[in-house]
C-alpha cells in the first residue's frame, strides 16, 4: 500500500485523523519538507531578538538581535551585547582595551599591535586603542637625501604607558 | 510556574522619580542575572541596565548614566530599579529578564510583562 503521506508537500502535513489528507500547516507553524506527519511551531522572534523575516507555512521565522546586540550560535540562538571600539567584552562587561592591544569592532577580543620590526619596518602611525599601528618603510629603504621632513613615530613598546 | 512581575510603574512628572520592581517566583534569583530592557511606543526594544549574580553592574544605555541605579535583594527574590531625573524621552515599558549573564541573551530567558513608566507633565 503506497504511504499518500509522501504525496503531501512542503507547507502541509500529513493528517492521519483524516485518512492521511494533506492539510494546511495551522497559523504559527510551517514545514519545510513534504511528507511530514506534524508541522512545526514557529520560531517567536521576541525580547532581544527581532524578527528577520516571518514565518511562513514553508520556513521558519529568522530572527535578528536588537540594537547594541549581536547574534551569536546557529540560526542567531544568542545575542551578545555589543561592546564600543576600543573595547572587549568580559565577564564584567565591556573593559577598554590594554594599552598595546586593540580592536576595530563592536564585538571580539583586543588584539596585540602589529611588531613593525619584525618585519623589519618603522612605525608609520602609532596604534590606539580602536587603530592597529600603521608600518612603513624600513629605515634602511630610507635615503638620507629622500627622507620625509616628518620623521616616523617611535614605536612604543606594550606595557608602558604614554607620556 | 517560573516568572518574573514587574511592578512601580506609573505617570510621574518631568525630574521625578520612581522606583521599579522585578519579583522572581518559582526559581532562584540569586542564580541568575537581571536585566531591565525598555521599550518605548514604535521603537525597538533597547537595553537598560543589567546587575550580574554577584552584583556587577552594566549599564547598556548611555543616556541613563548618573540617572539610573540597579540593586537586589536576594533574600526577597527582587531586583529594584530606581530611575531619578526622570525625562519625557524614558517614557516606556520596562521589562525585566533573567539572563545566567548579562553580557548574552538567549531564547530561553524568563522576560516578565512589563510595566509602564510614563514620564509627563
Known amino acids: 500500500l503506497q504511504d499518500l503521506c509522501s504525496n503531501c508537500p512542503a507547507g502541509t502535513f500529513c493528517d492521519n485523523n483524516r485518512s492521511q489528507i494533506c492539510s494546511p500547516c495551522p497559523p504559527n507553524s510551517f514545514s519545510s519538507a513534504g511528507g511530514q506527519r506534524t508541522c512545526d511551531i514557529c520560531r517567536q522572534c521576541k525580547g532581544v531578538f527581532k524578527t528577520r523575516k516571518e514565518c511562513s507555512s514553508t520556513s521558519n521565522a529568522e530572527c535578528d538581535c536588537i540594537s547594541g546586540y549581536h547574534c551569536l550560535g546557529a540560526e542567531c540562538s544568542m545575542c551578545e551585547q555589543d561592546c564600543k571600539q576600543g573595547q572587549e567584552l568580559t565577564k564584567k562587561g565591556c573593559k577598554d582595551c590594554c594599552f598595546g592591544t586593540f580592536n576595530d569592532q563592536k564585538r571580539g577580543i583586543c588584539r596585540p599591535w602589529t611588531n613593525c620590526s619584525l618585519d623589519g619596518k618603522s612605525v608609520l602611525v602609532n596604534g590606539t586603542k580602536e587603530r592597529d599601528v600603521v608600518c612603513g618603510p624600513s629605515p634602511a629603504d630610507l635615503s638620507p637625501g629622500a627622507s620625509s621632513a616628518t620623521p616616523p613615530a617611535p614605536a612604543r613598546e606594550p606595557g608602558h604607558s604614554p607620556q | 510556574q517560573l516568572q518574573l512581575v514587574e511592578s512601580g510603574g506609573g505617570l510621574v512628572q518631568p525630574g521625578g522619580s520612581l522606583r521599579l520592581s522585578c519579583a522572581a517566583s518559582g526559581f532562584t534569583l540569586a542564580d541568575y542575572a537581571i536585566g531591565w530592557f525598555r521599550q518605548a511606543p514604535g521603537k525597538e526594544r533597547e537595553g537598560v541596565l543589567c546587575i550580574s549574580s554577584s552584583g556587577d553592574v552594566t549599564i547598556y544605555a548611555d543616556s541613563v548614566k548618573g540617572r539610573f541605579t540597579i540593586s537586589r535583594d536576594n533574600a526577597k527574590n527582587t531586583v529594584y530599579l530606581q530611575m531619578n531625573s526622570l525625562k519625557p524621552e524614558d517614557t516606556a515599558v520596562y521589562y525585566c529578564?533573567?539572563?545566567?549573564?548579562?553580557?548574552?541573551?538567549?531564547?530561553?530567558?524568563?522576560w516578565g510583562q512589563g510595566t509602564q513608566v510614563t514620564v509627563s507633565s
Open positions: 529578564v533573567a539572563p545566567r549573564i548579562c553580557s548574552t541573551y538567549s531564547s530561553d530567558d524568563y
